[in-house]
């Protein structure tokens, strides 16, 4: 009987990330007796919900239940039945729903009501659905990556547990790119902030952190593309838009009503003499880059330094983890390696965008054309945002680490969100040592 395995004393948590383009469900697991230790929570499952983001269900809310079924059933399978009732479920909606709420608070509420009704039908401990703020999204992303990198641990290790981990306790900045917003979060050199709205103060594991964060609504990759199209069609002489951000030979018809559906294009809205226009790709990185830069207003700054649109940005400091769409896009383009310089990335983007559409389709036959067609824009947008928007340079580019997962857990806001809501990040350092050395072996 001595050799009989004891039942695992573990806990689970579920977070649904209801993004603008899709919803993902994450299942986390941790040893029950080590709740307050740093780095013990890890992701055991990610389930991507089939279909668009929840904001797209505004005219078909009755379909939300079916939409969520597969991933919720998957959670039922992964988590032992005996633990269903004590497993918390959180749904956080991000910029897609922020935009819907700007259009109609009532419609946004209706979507969340139906989401809540659907999730309440499962045997888990459902804790509600809410639209998280851009500030939360940035802060929780920062907490996630630093928790996973072991930056909150008081032990200084002589070796690294992840490839890009530096052995000091300096935290990583967080760069998050979604479909509808983008967040930048880091600990600046100077703790005093010129802009209190962008300042957060945390006490985690006995240490104080003064964090800068900002979320740029409408500057996620999908909404930035809509903005660019709305801006460029203003000066088109007819219903043909020759677009440098799409491959030569690429053609796509866009409805003007779709273009002006989002609040993000309101500033460019005008009465056009046509209901549709056709994008015709010309595949020119430099021109695409120039067109994107017009989305960033850098002429006005009421602070010592700004990112764009008059938003304060302190001088960049330390290493940064760039995740979500920053990672997915750069991974597709094969540009995530630490060895690839900014100049090399630019060169690769010039070549990629100039490739004919037919050639691209052949080379990436397995990729959906809708996504495939937008990598030239997305890659160029990432470069423009990081270099001109956030003021990274060729030198500081080397401090950007494109991260998908850290020790098996996805980089993103969901883990930090759950750690906070389950009170698993103590303000003070726990008395017991966080992890024994043997854990690392």
């Amino acid at each position: 009987t001595q050799n009989k395995a004891l039942p695992e004393n573990v806990k689970y948590g579920i977070v649904l990330d209801a993004g603008s383009s899709h919803t993902s469900l994450y299942i986390y697991k941790w040893p029950a007796e080590k709740e307050n230790d740093t780095g013990v929570v890890h992701q055991v499952e990610e389930c991507r919900v089939k279909g668009p983001g929840i904001s797209k269900f505004v005219q078909k809310v009755n379909e939300i239940g079916i939409y969520l079924t597969d991933c919720m059933e998957r959670a039922r399978e992964v988590i032992p039945r005996s633990q269903h009732q004590e497993t918390p479920v959180y749904l956080g909606a991000t910029a897609g729903m922020r935009l819907l709420r700007m259009e109609s608070e009532e419609l946004a509420d209706r979507v969340l009501d139906v989401v809540e009704r659907s999730l309440s039908n499962y045997p888990f401990d459902f804790q509600g659905a809410r639209i998280i703020t851009g500030q939360e999204e940035g802060a929780y992303g920062w907490i996630t990556i630093n928790y996973l990198l072991g930056k909150f641990s008081q032990k200084t290790r002589w070796f690294s547990i992840v490839p890009y981990e530096t052995n000091n306790q300096e935290t990583f900045g967080a760069l998050d790119l979604g479909g509808a917003s983008t967040q930048v979060t880091f600990v600046p050199q100077n703790a005093t902030s010129e802009s209190p709205a962008n300042a957060l103060a945390f006490r985690l594991y006995g240490k104080d952190y003064n964090v800068y964060t900002h979320s740029f609504l409408c500057y996620g990759k999908d909404q930035a593309l809509w903005q660019k199209l709305a801006k460029d069609i203003q000066v088109a002489s007819n219903e043909i838009l020759r677009d440098p951000c799409f491959h030569p030979g690429y053609k796509k018809v866009v409805n003007v009503s779709d273009l002006y559906k989002t609040p993000c294009t309101k500033r460019f809205e005008m009465t056009l003499p046509f209901q549709q226009f056709e994008i015709q790709g010309i595949g020119n990185y430099q021109q695409c880059h120039q067109s994107i830069l017009e989305l960033f207003n850098t002429s006005y700054c009421p602070y010592s330094q700004c990112a764009f649109n008059g938003i304060f940005l302190p001088p960049l400091q330390g290493d940064f983890g760039a995740f979500s769409a920053f990672y997915f896009v750069m991974k597709f383009l094969n540009l995530t390696s630490e060895k690839v310089s900014q100049e090399k990335v630019t060169e690769m983007m010039k070549k990629f965008c100039a490739q004919p559409w037919e050639e691209i389709k052949t080379s990436y036959a397995g990729v959906k054309e809708k996504y495939l067609s937008e990598y030239c824009f997305s890659g160029t947008y990432i470069l423009s945002l990081l270099l001109q928007g956030y003021h990274f340079t060729a030198d500081s580019w080397e401090h950007i680490h494109f991260i998908g997962k850290i020790q098996g857990s996805d980089a993103g806001w969901t883990l930090g969100y759950m750690l906070n809501l389950t009170n698993m990040i103590p303000a003070e350092q726990p008395l017991s040592t966080p992890l024994s050395h043997s854990t690392y072996v």
Epitope: R101, E105, D109, L112, D113, E116, R117, S120, F126, Q127, G128, A129, R130, I131, T133
Partner: antibody, heavy 121, light 107 residues
Framework: QVQLVQSGAEVKKPGASVKVSCKAS????????MHWVRQAPGQGLEWMGR????????WYAQKFQGRVTMTRDTSTSTVYMELSSLRSEDTAVYYC??????????????WGQGTLVTVSS | EIVLTQSPGTLSLSPGERATLSCRAS???????LAWYQQKPGQAPRLLIY???NRHTGIPDRFSGSGSGTDFTLTISRLEPEDFAVYYC????????FGGGTKVEIK
């Protein structure tokens, strides 16, 4: 569908306290704030305060501070409004009204049927 | 606190006529923070308009809201028999306040 069902009419003596309940159903109770508004006979509407059922935090109108207490019981999806040191001018119909989700705007989307509180010696 | 003054106090009109109700704030109110309610005798108020001009679910399109800053208007384009009631405006700026109400009665 969303329903807010309030407790029955009360008759109280001056100086006493009254506790009115409002039971919510048809939605996730913790997701929306709950407000209390009163209306004296033949008069207009007067906002008393609100409670966030998720965390129990409250915000009271200046006029009622120190006399009003709003609480909630998440297990029964019920909010309570207690008014102490009653006087004759507190005679009114008291309404609970569902407010906003976090991050929304403060308008009152759904109202209870009202509870008449009469203060008389 | 912001004071809302509604005028007129009473509006006597016939069915089919247009009703224009005014709500003036003692200081500027963000449009997204102004709402209108209807109350019939013995009933709880009912939300009509939020965000100054957005109709609540199920509210007929004869009701419309407009205005910004300190001056807001509720318009009922063609009065139906069921529209005769008291109408309140409401603002939110740290605390909620209501206007004194306008009674729309049958002439």
């Amino acid at each position: 569908q969303v329903q807010l069902v309030q407790s029955g009419a009360e008759v109280k003596k001056p100086g006493a306290s009254v506790k009115v309940s409002c039971k919510a159903s048809g939605y996730t109770f913790k997701s929306y704030e709950m407000h209390w508004v009163r209306q004296a006979p033949g008069q207009g509407l007067e906002w008393m305060g609100r409670i966030n059922p998720s965390v129990g935090s409250t915000w009271y109108a200046q006029k009622f501070q120190g006399r009003v207490t709003m609480t909630r019981d998440t297990s029964t999806s019920t909010v309570y409004m207690e008014l102490s040191s009653l006087r004759s001018e507190d005679t009114a119909v008291y309404y609970c009204a569902r407010g906003k989700r976090e991050g929304g705007t403060e308008y009152l989307r759904k109202w209870g049927q009202g509870t008449l509180v009469t203060v008389s010696s | 606190e912001i004071v809302l003054t509604q005028s007129p106090g009473t509006l006597s009109l016939s069915p089919g006529e247009r009703a224009t109700l005014s709500c003036r704030a003692s200081q500027s109110v963000a449009s997204s923070y102004l709402a209108w309610y209807q109350q019939k005798p013995g009933q709880a108020p009912r939300l009509l308009i939020y965000g100054a001009s957005n109709r609540h679910t199920g509210i007929p399109d004869r009701f419309s809201g407009s205005g910004s800053g300190t001056d807001f208007t509720l318009t009922i384009s063609r009065l139906e028999p069921e529209d005769f009631a008291v109408y309140y405006c409401q603002q939110y700026h740290n605390a909620i306040t209501f206007g004194g109400g306008t009674k729309v009665e049958i002439k």
